[in-house]
Interface confidence: low
Amino acid sequence: LQDLCSNCPAGTFCDNNRSQICSPCPPNSFSSAGGQRTCDICRQCKGVFKTRKECSSTSNAECDCISGYHCLGAECSMCEQDCKQGQELTKKGCKDCCFGTFNDQKRGICRPWTNCSLDGKSVLVNGTKERDVVCGPSPADLSPGASSATPPAPAREPGHSPQ
Protein backbone atom coordinates (compact mmCIF):
# COMPACT_ATOMS: atom_id res chain seq x y z
CA LEU A 1 0.00 0.00 0.00
CA GLN A 2 1.10 3.52 -0.78
CA ASP A 3 2.19 5.31 2.38
CA LEU A 4 -0.10 8.31 2.46
CA CYS A 5 1.89 9.75 5.35
CA SER A 6 4.14 11.06 2.59
CA ASN A 7 1.49 13.78 2.22
CA CYS A 8 2.66 15.38 5.44
CA PRO A 9 5.29 18.02 4.66
CA ALA A 10 8.24 19.05 6.77
CA GLY A 11 7.07 20.93 9.83
CA THR A 12 4.20 18.51 10.44
CA PHE A 13 3.75 14.92 11.53
CA CYS A 14 1.39 12.20 10.42
CA ASP A 15 -0.96 11.49 13.30
CA ASN A 16 -3.35 8.66 12.55
CA ASN A 17 -5.15 8.75 15.88
CA ARG A 18 -6.96 11.98 16.65
CA SER A 19 -5.68 14.68 14.36
CA GLN A 20 -7.77 15.38 11.33
CA ILE A 21 -5.04 17.31 9.59
CA CYS A 22 -1.32 16.75 9.26
CA SER A 23 -0.56 18.04 12.72
CA PRO A 24 1.89 20.92 12.96
CA CYS A 25 4.89 20.10 15.10
CA PRO A 26 4.22 21.19 18.68
CA PRO A 27 6.24 24.08 20.12
CA ASN A 28 9.93 23.26 20.56
CA SER A 29 9.85 20.42 18.06
CA PHE A 30 10.53 20.06 14.35
CA SER A 31 10.44 17.70 11.38
CA SER A 32 12.97 18.44 8.68
CA ALA A 33 11.52 15.96 6.16
CA GLY A 34 8.04 15.06 5.01
CA GLY A 35 6.19 11.91 6.01
CA GLN A 36 7.35 11.89 9.63
CA ARG A 37 5.18 10.17 12.22
CA THR A 38 6.71 12.22 15.03
CA CYS A 39 8.46 15.54 15.41
CA ASP A 40 11.89 15.69 17.02
CA ILE A 41 12.50 17.78 20.11
CA CYS A 42 14.45 20.94 19.37
CA ARG A 43 17.97 21.13 20.67
CA GLN A 44 18.29 23.62 23.53
CA CYS A 45 21.41 25.78 23.65
CA LYS A 46 21.99 26.11 27.40
CA GLY A 47 24.90 26.62 29.74
CA VAL A 48 28.12 26.99 27.77
CA PHE A 49 26.07 26.80 24.56
CA LYS A 50 24.39 29.81 22.98
CA THR A 51 21.85 29.83 20.16
CA ARG A 52 23.27 30.52 16.72
CA LYS A 53 20.05 29.64 14.87
CA GLU A 54 16.62 29.35 16.43
CA CYS A 55 14.66 26.12 16.07
CA SER A 56 11.85 26.29 13.51
CA SER A 57 9.13 23.78 12.71
CA THR A 58 11.33 22.44 9.88
CA SER A 59 14.86 22.70 11.26
CA ASN A 60 16.67 22.10 14.52
CA ALA A 61 18.32 24.83 16.54
CA GLU A 62 22.04 25.32 16.00
CA CYS A 63 24.34 26.15 18.89
CA ASP A 64 27.62 27.98 19.32
CA CYS A 65 29.73 28.27 22.43
CA ILE A 66 29.68 31.25 24.74
CA SER A 67 32.69 33.55 24.88
CA GLY A 68 35.74 31.80 26.29
CA TYR A 69 34.77 28.43 24.76
CA HIS A 70 34.93 26.87 21.30
CA CYS A 71 32.98 24.15 19.52
CA LEU A 72 34.11 20.56 19.26
CA GLY A 73 32.51 17.67 17.40
CA ALA A 74 29.86 17.51 14.71
CA GLU A 75 27.24 20.25 14.96
CA CYS A 76 29.05 21.74 17.94
CA SER A 77 28.19 18.85 20.21
CA MET A 78 30.65 20.00 22.89
CA CYS A 79 32.19 23.23 24.09
CA GLU A 80 35.82 23.29 25.20
CA GLN A 81 37.43 26.07 27.19
CA ASP A 82 39.60 28.50 25.24
CA CYS A 83 43.21 29.06 26.28
CA LYS A 84 45.49 31.92 25.34
CA GLN A 85 47.87 31.70 22.46
CA GLY A 86 51.02 30.03 23.77
CA GLN A 87 48.97 27.63 25.90
CA GLU A 88 47.20 24.29 25.64
CA LEU A 89 44.30 22.80 27.57
CA THR A 90 45.21 19.98 29.93
CA LYS A 91 43.20 18.15 32.57
CA LYS A 92 44.43 20.74 35.00
CA GLY A 93 43.42 23.70 32.84
CA CYS A 94 45.40 25.93 30.51
CA LYS A 95 49.19 25.42 30.67
CA ASP A 96 51.97 27.32 28.89
CA CYS A 97 53.59 25.55 25.96
CA CYS A 98 56.87 23.86 26.90
CA PHE A 99 60.08 25.25 25.45
CA GLY A 100 60.39 24.19 21.82
CA THR A 101 56.64 24.12 21.23
CA PHE A 102 54.06 26.72 20.29
CA ASN A 103 50.33 27.26 19.82
CA ASP A 104 49.14 30.21 17.78
CA GLN A 105 45.42 29.54 18.48
CA LYS A 106 43.09 29.60 21.45
CA ARG A 107 42.39 25.90 21.00
CA GLY A 108 44.37 22.78 20.26
CA ILE A 109 47.69 21.55 21.54
CA CYS A 110 51.21 22.94 21.51
CA ARG A 111 53.17 21.76 18.46
CA PRO A 112 56.95 21.50 18.12
CA TRP A 113 58.80 24.28 16.35
CA THR A 114 59.82 23.48 12.82
CA ASN A 115 63.31 21.96 12.63
CA CYS A 116 64.84 24.18 9.97
CA SER A 117 67.99 22.07 9.69
CA LEU A 118 65.99 19.09 8.39
CA ASP A 119 65.40 21.13 5.24
CA GLY A 120 68.99 22.29 5.21
CA LYS A 121 67.91 25.75 6.24
CA SER A 122 68.78 28.03 9.08
CA VAL A 123 66.62 29.74 11.71
CA LEU A 124 65.81 33.23 10.55
CA VAL A 125 63.45 34.15 13.41
CA ASN A 126 63.40 32.33 16.70
CA GLY A 127 60.22 30.58 17.84
CA THR A 128 58.17 31.59 20.85
CA LYS A 129 55.32 29.96 22.77
CA GLU A 130 52.91 31.69 20.39
CA ARG A 131 54.81 31.49 17.10
CA ASP A 132 56.73 28.93 15.10
CA VAL A 133 60.29 29.61 14.04
CA VAL A 134 60.83 31.18 10.64
CA CYS A 135 63.33 29.30 8.49
CA GLY A 136 65.64 31.15 6.16
CA PRO A 137 68.08 30.21 3.41
CA SER A 138 70.59 27.49 4.13
CA PRO A 139 73.97 28.64 5.51
CA ALA A 140 75.64 27.51 2.24
CA ASP A 141 73.33 29.75 0.23
CA LEU A 142 74.55 32.67 2.25
CA SER A 143 78.31 31.93 1.76
CA PRO A 144 80.37 34.34 -0.39
CA GLY A 145 80.59 33.39 -4.09
CA ALA A 146 77.39 31.43 -4.15
CA SER A 147 75.63 32.23 -7.42
CA SER A 148 71.96 32.93 -7.24
CA ALA A 149 71.77 32.06 -10.93
CA THR A 150 72.65 28.39 -10.39
CA PRO A 151 69.67 26.34 -11.50
CA PRO A 152 68.32 23.84 -8.99
CA ALA A 153 69.16 20.19 -9.49
CA PRO A 154 66.39 18.42 -11.45
CA ALA A 155 64.06 16.41 -9.28
CA ARG A 156 64.17 12.67 -9.85
CA GLU A 157 61.01 10.66 -10.40
CA PRO A 158 60.60 8.01 -7.76
CA GLY A 159 61.78 4.59 -8.83
CA HIS A 160 64.18 5.87 -11.47
CA SER A 161 67.92 5.49 -10.97
CA PRO A 162 70.04 8.49 -11.75
CA GLN A 163 71.31 8.65 -15.33
Epitope: L1, Q2, L4, C5, N7, C8, P9, C14, D15, N16, N17, R18, S19, Q20, I21, C22, S23
Partner: antibody, heavy 119, light 107 residues
Framework: QVQLQQPGAELVRPGASMKLSCKAS????????INWVKQRPGQGLEWIGN????????NYNQKFKDKATLTVDKSSSTAYMQLSSPTSEDSAVYYC????????????WGQGTTLTVSS | DIQMTQTTSSLSASLGDRVTISCRAS??????LNWYQQKPDGTVKLLIY???RLHSGVPPRFSGSGSGTNYSLTISNLEQEDIATYFC?????????FGGGTKLEIK
Protein backbone atom coordinates in the same frame (compact mmCIF):
# COMPACT_ATOMS: atom_id res chain seq x y z
CA GLN B 1 -7.81 -5.05 -3.70
CA VAL B 2 -9.50 -2.34 -1.65
CA GLN B 3 -13.29 -2.39 -1.92
CA LEU B 4 -16.06 -0.46 -0.21
CA GLN B 5 -19.38 -2.13 -0.98
CA GLN B 6 -22.66 -0.23 -0.65
CA PRO B 7 -26.21 -1.20 -1.58
CA GLY B 8 -27.26 0.49 -4.83
CA ALA B 9 -30.52 1.95 -3.54
CA GLU B 10 -32.66 2.30 -0.42
CA LEU B 11 -36.21 3.54 0.00
CA VAL B 12 -37.39 4.96 3.30
CA ARG B 13 -40.57 6.59 4.53
CA PRO B 14 -40.33 10.16 5.85
CA GLY B 15 -39.60 10.16 9.57
CA ALA B 16 -38.58 6.49 9.66
CA SER B 17 -35.02 6.15 10.95
CA MET B 18 -32.75 4.08 8.73
CA LYS B 19 -29.15 2.85 8.42
CA LEU B 20 -26.89 2.86 5.37
CA SER B 21 -24.10 0.30 5.26
CA CYS B 22 -20.60 0.16 3.83
CA LYS B 23 -18.67 -3.11 3.88
CA ALA B 24 -14.90 -2.81 3.62
CA SER B 25 -12.50 -5.43 2.29
CA UNK B 26 -8.96 -5.72 0.96
CA UNK B 27 -7.27 -3.75 3.74
CA UNK B 28 -7.02 -3.48 7.53
CA UNK B 29 -10.40 -2.01 8.40
CA UNK B 30 -9.33 -0.58 11.78
CA UNK B 31 -6.42 1.44 10.33
CA UNK B 32 -8.36 3.82 8.08
CA UNK B 33 -11.04 6.39 8.78
CA ILE B 34 -14.39 5.72 7.10
CA ASN B 35 -16.00 8.92 5.81
CA TRP B 36 -19.48 9.60 4.53
CA VAL B 37 -20.20 12.07 1.74
CA LYS B 38 -23.58 13.31 0.51
CA GLN B 39 -24.49 14.31 -3.04
CA ARG B 40 -27.89 15.70 -3.85
CA PRO B 41 -29.09 15.26 -7.47
CA GLY B 42 -27.15 17.56 -9.76
CA GLN B 43 -25.25 19.03 -6.80
CA GLY B 44 -21.76 18.94 -5.35
CA LEU B 45 -20.30 16.79 -2.60
CA GLU B 46 -20.72 17.40 1.14
CA TRP B 47 -18.64 15.74 3.84
CA ILE B 48 -20.86 14.43 6.63
CA GLY B 49 -18.28 13.06 9.03
CA ASN B 50 -16.03 10.13 9.75
CA UNK B 51 -15.29 7.35 12.18
CA UNK B 52 -12.07 5.59 13.17
CA UNK B 53 -13.04 1.91 13.40
CA UNK B 54 -10.28 1.04 15.87
CA UNK B 55 -12.00 2.91 18.72
CA UNK B 56 -15.14 4.37 17.08
CA UNK B 57 -13.90 7.95 17.50
CA UNK B 58 -16.02 10.24 15.34
CA ASN B 59 -15.85 13.71 13.78
CA TYR B 60 -18.94 15.37 12.34
CA ASN B 61 -19.62 18.30 10.08
CA GLN B 62 -21.71 20.56 12.34
CA LYS B 63 -24.33 20.72 9.60
CA PHE B 64 -25.02 16.98 10.03
CA LYS B 65 -24.43 16.66 13.77
CA ASP B 66 -28.09 16.04 14.57
CA LYS B 67 -28.87 14.15 11.39
CA ALA B 68 -26.22 11.44 11.11
CA THR B 69 -24.85 8.89 13.57
CA LEU B 70 -21.80 6.89 12.52
CA THR B 71 -21.02 3.43 13.88
CA VAL B 72 -18.93 0.42 12.91
CA ASP B 73 -19.02 -3.32 13.38
CA LYS B 74 -15.40 -4.43 13.47
CA SER B 75 -16.28 -8.13 13.31
CA SER B 76 -17.82 -7.70 9.85
CA SER B 77 -15.65 -4.73 8.75
CA THR B 78 -18.80 -2.75 8.12
CA ALA B 79 -19.49 0.93 8.72
CA TYR B 80 -22.98 2.32 9.20
CA MET B 81 -24.60 5.72 8.98
CA GLN B 82 -27.96 6.18 10.63
CA LEU B 83 -30.11 9.09 9.47
CA SER B 84 -32.67 10.36 11.95
CA SER B 85 -36.14 11.51 10.91
CA PRO B 86 -35.44 11.49 7.15
CA THR B 87 -37.12 14.09 4.97
CA SER B 88 -37.06 14.72 1.24
CA GLU B 89 -33.96 16.88 1.88
CA ASP B 90 -32.12 13.68 2.77
CA SER B 91 -32.85 12.12 -0.62
CA ALA B 92 -29.38 11.89 -2.14
CA VAL B 93 -26.55 9.58 -3.07
CA TYR B 94 -24.43 8.71 -0.05
CA TYR B 95 -20.86 7.58 -0.55
CA CYS B 96 -18.60 5.93 1.95
CA UNK B 97 -14.91 6.56 1.41
CA UNK B 98 -11.75 5.96 3.36
CA UNK B 99 -8.74 8.00 4.33
CA UNK B 100 -5.57 7.13 6.16
CA UNK B 101 -5.16 10.23 8.30
CA UNK B 102 -6.44 13.76 8.44
CA UNK B 103 -5.17 15.57 5.40
CA UNK B 104 -4.65 12.57 3.19
CA UNK B 105 -7.16 12.20 0.36
CA UNK B 106 -10.19 9.97 0.10
CA UNK B 107 -8.31 7.30 -1.81
CA UNK B 108 -11.08 4.74 -2.36
CA TRP B 109 -14.81 5.29 -2.70
CA GLY B 110 -17.85 3.07 -2.54
CA GLN B 111 -20.25 3.05 -5.49
CA GLY B 112 -22.75 5.08 -3.50
CA THR B 113 -26.24 4.33 -2.21
CA THR B 114 -29.14 6.26 -3.71
CA LEU B 115 -31.48 7.03 -0.82
CA THR B 116 -35.04 7.97 -1.68
CA VAL B 117 -37.22 9.40 1.06
CA SER B 118 -40.78 9.07 -0.07
CA SER B 119 -44.17 8.06 1.21
CA ASP C 1 -15.64 26.59 6.98
CA ILE C 2 -13.23 26.85 4.08
CA GLN C 3 -15.15 27.55 0.85
CA MET C 4 -13.88 25.85 -2.29
CA THR C 5 -14.89 27.55 -5.55
CA GLN C 6 -14.75 26.07 -9.03
CA THR C 7 -15.81 29.04 -11.13
CA THR C 8 -16.34 27.02 -14.30
CA SER C 9 -19.26 24.65 -13.81
CA SER C 10 -19.03 23.18 -17.30
CA LEU C 11 -16.39 23.08 -19.97
CA SER C 12 -16.42 21.91 -23.60
CA ALA C 13 -13.26 20.68 -25.26
CA SER C 14 -12.16 18.54 -28.20
CA LEU C 15 -10.38 15.23 -27.98
CA GLY C 16 -6.63 15.81 -27.82
CA ASP C 17 -7.04 19.25 -26.25
CA ARG C 18 -5.18 20.46 -23.20
CA VAL C 19 -7.75 21.29 -20.54
CA THR C 20 -7.23 23.19 -17.30
CA ILE C 21 -9.76 23.23 -14.47
CA SER C 22 -9.27 25.71 -11.65
CA CYS C 23 -10.20 25.74 -7.98
CA ARG C 24 -9.92 28.52 -5.43
CA ALA C 25 -9.95 28.22 -1.64
CA SER C 26 -11.27 30.95 0.66
CA UNK C 27 -8.01 30.80 2.63
CA UNK C 28 -4.51 29.40 2.30
CA UNK C 29 -4.74 25.59 2.41
CA UNK C 30 -1.00 24.89 2.23
CA UNK C 31 -1.25 22.52 -0.76
CA UNK C 32 -3.69 20.18 1.00
CA LEU C 33 -5.72 20.00 -2.20
CA ASN C 34 -7.07 16.82 -3.81
CA TRP C 35 -8.81 16.23 -7.14
CA TYR C 36 -11.50 13.62 -7.85
CA GLN C 37 -13.16 12.40 -11.03
CA GLN C 38 -16.85 11.45 -11.01
CA LYS C 39 -18.00 9.50 -14.04
CA PRO C 40 -21.56 9.85 -15.38
CA ASP C 41 -22.46 6.53 -13.66
CA GLY C 42 -21.56 8.09 -10.28
CA THR C 43 -18.23 6.30 -9.78
CA VAL C 44 -15.75 8.52 -7.93
CA LYS C 45 -11.98 8.13 -8.16
CA LEU C 46 -9.05 9.98 -6.65
CA LEU C 47 -6.81 11.51 -9.31
CA ILE C 48 -4.35 13.82 -7.57
CA TYR C 49 -3.54 14.45 -3.94
CA UNK C 50 -1.50 17.09 -2.13
CA UNK C 51 -1.79 19.43 -5.14
CA UNK C 52 0.42 17.53 -7.58
CA ARG C 53 0.91 13.90 -6.58
CA LEU C 54 -0.62 11.40 -8.97
CA HIS C 55 -2.60 8.61 -7.32
CA SER C 56 -1.53 5.12 -8.30
CA GLY C 57 -2.99 3.95 -11.61
CA VAL C 58 -3.89 7.47 -12.81
CA PRO C 59 -2.58 8.23 -16.34
CA PRO C 60 0.27 10.78 -16.46
CA ARG C 61 -1.75 13.06 -18.74
CA PHE C 62 -3.33 14.30 -15.51
CA SER C 63 -1.32 16.82 -13.51
CA GLY C 64 -1.95 19.30 -10.74
CA SER C 65 -0.37 22.51 -9.59
CA GLY C 66 -0.94 25.52 -7.39
CA SER C 67 -0.25 26.95 -3.97
CA GLY C 68 -1.86 29.13 -1.33
CA THR C 69 -5.45 29.60 -2.43
CA ASN C 70 -5.25 28.86 -6.17
CA TYR C 71 -5.00 25.39 -7.67
CA SER C 72 -5.53 23.74 -11.02
CA LEU C 73 -5.93 20.36 -12.65
CA THR C 74 -4.64 19.88 -16.20
CA ILE C 75 -5.45 17.12 -18.65
CA SER C 76 -2.76 17.34 -21.31
CA ASN C 77 -4.32 15.24 -24.07
CA LEU C 78 -8.06 14.85 -23.60
CA GLU C 79 -9.45 11.36 -24.20
CA GLN C 80 -13.02 10.15 -24.47
CA GLU C 81 -12.78 8.36 -21.11
CA ASP C 82 -11.99 11.68 -19.39
CA ILE C 83 -15.57 12.87 -19.86
CA ALA C 84 -16.64 13.35 -16.25
CA THR C 85 -17.17 15.91 -13.49
CA TYR C 86 -14.08 16.98 -11.59
CA PHE C 87 -14.13 18.06 -7.95
CA CYS C 88 -11.45 19.68 -5.83
CA UNK C 89 -11.36 19.10 -2.07
CA UNK C 90 -9.35 20.66 0.74
CA UNK C 91 -7.79 18.52 3.45
CA UNK C 92 -6.45 21.41 5.50
CA UNK C 93 -9.18 21.97 8.06
CA UNK C 94 -12.34 20.31 9.32
CA UNK C 95 -14.91 20.11 7.97
CA UNK C 96 -13.55 18.80 4.70
CA UNK C 97 -15.08 20.77 1.84
CA PHE C 98 -15.42 20.25 -1.89
CA GLY C 99 -15.67 22.56 -4.85
CA GLY C 100 -18.94 22.60 -6.76
CA GLY C 101 -17.49 20.55 -9.62
CA THR C 102 -16.59 21.18 -13.25
CA LYS C 103 -18.40 19.08 -15.83
CA LEU C 104 -16.20 18.29 -18.82
CA GLU C 105 -17.94 17.65 -22.14
CA ILE C 106 -16.79 16.92 -25.68
CA LYS C 107 -17.36 19.58 -28.35
Amino acid sequence: QVQLQQPGAELVRPGASMKLSCKASGYTFTSYWINWVKQRPGQGLEWIGNIYPSDSYTNYNQKFKDKATLTVDKSSSTAYMQLSSPTSEDSAVYYCTRLYYGSSPFDYWGQGTTLTVSS
Amino acid sequence: DIQMTQTTSSLSASLGDRVTISCRASQDISNYLNWYQQKPDGTVKLLIYHTSRLHSGVPPRFSGSGSGTNYSLTISNLEQEDIATYFCQQGHTLPRTFGGGTKLEIK
